[in-house]
């Protein structure tokens, strides 16, 4: 049973899907594997609040706790990466703030950056010093365990010396790393020590033990690396937004709505009107006006704009964004004020949100 | 883990109605559409139409307009399909699914037979 | 309603080959297609979302490209497993509307 009663036949026009989503970001909380984590639930006012990790409720455990409005993740693991969302639920409605955590190896992104100084990794000896392999740099070695968004590239690196120089193989899961082995190959950086995985997909999870070896000895060291996965969700509106906003008669008025989908966003506008003098139909529900809607005749849906404002405009604004998954919104009220009464701006309105491609 | 479970069939009479049940547990029951999906072996997979059950807002393909009747039911996490006015070419393989179409239930058969 | 165009109907192919499938949407649906695996008396199985990407647990033989209005999607290696139909799905605008089906058969 639908939550409320629409006004007038809002049948909507067919979609025009745009070539990309315009969509913001949640925030990003990053923890390298094994650090503490805490977040804050940026909700006010909250009797109750409870946490999800994508999408499935999250409890305490020995890893996890949950004190008031701060969730605290123990040693952190890469299965910690994810969507969260905590709800803060009061009397009369609830609100959702969601973020992003990533456990996460920052030196597995596959950067290059570190590359221009392989010529101190590649040693040259004195050719009568004999010598067994050897590690030449073990800070570069010390994160064993890289976690890695899916579609990343990651780079392993073995910096080592010996003489003669020794040559370097790669093991994946203790078996010999063919390139046949993944869709796209591998590049291996003799002169680096270094195994280059590009857009690493889930099957890439493994352990990959680099072997570095010549006549006189063989060493061996070996990664792990977790292919962090995100499944779609449904869309996530950023906190805050559209932020509650006042006018003076007359007045012109924006409100923001900042959508983060992973899939086509439907993006709806609407606002509760009276009708024959009443706030609510004979079921009980409000009646609910659709004032503008993503689709073909709609530019910039995520923007409602009034002009020449009248005391009838004041009220609740809802932005209401859905997908094939769910959907999301989050409301903001606008206070009208008497021509005579300077407008005290609740928060900044801006009309051009930033969006994160 | 996240499932949906659906009954395995239902024999009903032409002209009948039929109301069939899809119980979803594993993961949170409104913040997810549930599609429900029809199947014929001449017509292969049709999208009848979704629910949000948190307000029990829906959005129907149009050919199932006046046929299918979604709500939900928070209380016990259950989605329900109603068809009316049953005729042999709803004999079919109805299923539901999870909003990101990632968790399907088993299906339930309806025969319509007199 | 949005269109999708799915083709070939069958083909029958021996393991180890490369399959590949293609959906042309009758308008724009951007990236948002779905690619589905149906063996019978099976549930569907969401094997790509988003046009590309690889749902959790599916093997990487499964890959899928594309975006506007046409879609392919790969099978690699094929396997005697991946006898099934094979479904695709636009999931931008309602009615969400998929293809007509592939089956494959294996030699």
């Known amino acids: 049973r639908p939550s409320f009663s629409l006004v007038e036949d809002t049948t909507l026009e067919p979609e025009e899907p745009p070539t990309k989503y315009q969509i913001s970001q949640p925030e990003v909380y990053v923890a390298a594997p094994g650090e503490s984590l805490e977040v804050r639930c940026l909700l006010k006012d909250a009797a109750v609040i409870s946490w999800t990790k994508d999408g499935v409720h999250l409890g305490p455990n020995n890893r996890t706790v949950l004190i008031g409005e701060y969730l605290q993740i123990k040693g952190a693991t890469p299965r910690d990466s994810g969507l969260y969302a905590c709800t803060a639920s009061r009397t009369v409605d609830s609100e959702t703030w969601y973020f992003m955590v990533n456990v996460t190896d920052a030196i597995s992104s596959g950067d290059d950056e570190d590359d221009t100084d392989g010529a101190e990794d590649f040693v040259s000896e004195n050719s009568n010093n004999k010598r067994a392999p050897y590690w030449t740099n073990t800070e570069k070695m010390e994160k064993r365990l890289h976690a890695v968004p899916a579609a990343n590239t990651v780079k392993f690196r073995c910096p080592a010396g010996g003489n003669p120089m020794p040559t370097m193989r790669w093991l994946k899961n203790g078996k010999e790393f063919k390139q046949e082995h993944r869709i796209g190959g591998y590049k291996v950086r003799n002169q680096h020590w270094s195994l280059i995985m590009e857009s690493v997909v889930p099957s890439d999870k493994g352990n990959y033990t680099c072997v570095v070896e010549n006549e006189y000895g063989s060493i061996n060291h070996t990664y792990h690396l977790d292919v962090v996965e995100r499944s779609p969700h449904r869309p996530i509106l950023q906190a805050g937004l559209p932020a509650n906003a006042s006018t003076v008669v007359g007045g012109d008025v924006e409100f923001v709505c900042k959508v983060y989908s992973d899939a086509q966003p439907h993006i709806q506008w609407i606002k509760h009107v009276e009708k024959n003098g009443s706030k609510y139909g004979p079921d009980g529900l409000p009646y609910l006006k659709v004032l503008k809607h993503s689709g073909i005749n709609s530019s910039n849906a995520e923007v409602l704009a009034l002009f020449n404002v009248t005391e009838a405009d004041a009220g609740e604004y809802i932005c209401k964004v859905s997908n094939y998954i769910g959907q999301a919104n989050q409301s903001a009220w606008l206070t009208v004020l008497p021509k005579q009464q300077a407008p005290g701006r609740e928060k900044e309105i801006t009309a051009s949100p930033d969006y994160l491609e | 883990q996240v499932q949906l479970q659906q009954p395995g069939a239902e024999v009903v009479k032409p002209g009948a109605s039929v109301k069939m049940s899809c119980k979803a547990s594993?993961?949170?029951?409104?913040?997810?559409?549930v599609h429900w999906v029809k199947q014929t072996p001449g017509q292969g997979l049709e999208w009848i139409g979704s629910?949000?059950?948190?307000?029990?807002?829906?959005s129907y393909n149009q050919n199932f307009k006046g046929k299918a009747t979604l709500t939900a039911d928070k209380s016990s996490s259950t989605a329900y399909i109603q068809l009316s006015s049953l005729t042999s070419e709803d004999s079919a393989v109805y299923y539901c699914?999870?909003?990101?179409?990632?968790?399907w239930g088993q299906g339930t058969l309806v025969t319509v037979s007199v | 309603n949005i269109v999708m165009t799915q083709s070939p109907k069958s083909m029958s192919m021996s393991v180890g080959d490369r399959v590949s499938i293609t959906c042309k949407a009758s308008q724009g649906v951007s990236n948002d297609v779905a690619w589905y695996q149906k063996k019978p008396g099976q549930s569907p199985k969401l094997l790509i979302y988003s046009a590309s990407y690889r749902y959790t647990g599916v093997p990487d033989r499964f890959t899928g490209s594309g975006s506007g209005t046409d879609f392919t999607f790969t099978i690699s290696n094929v396997q005697a497993e991946d006898l099934a139909v094979y479904y695709c799905q636009q999931h931008s605008t309602t009615p969400y509307t998929f293809g007509g089906g592939t089956k494959l058969e294996i030699k």
């Open positions: 594993g993961y949170i029951f409104t913040t997810y559409n």
């Open positions: 699914a999870r909003g990101d179409f990632a968790y």
């Open positions: 629910i949000y059950p948190d307000n029990g807002d829906t």
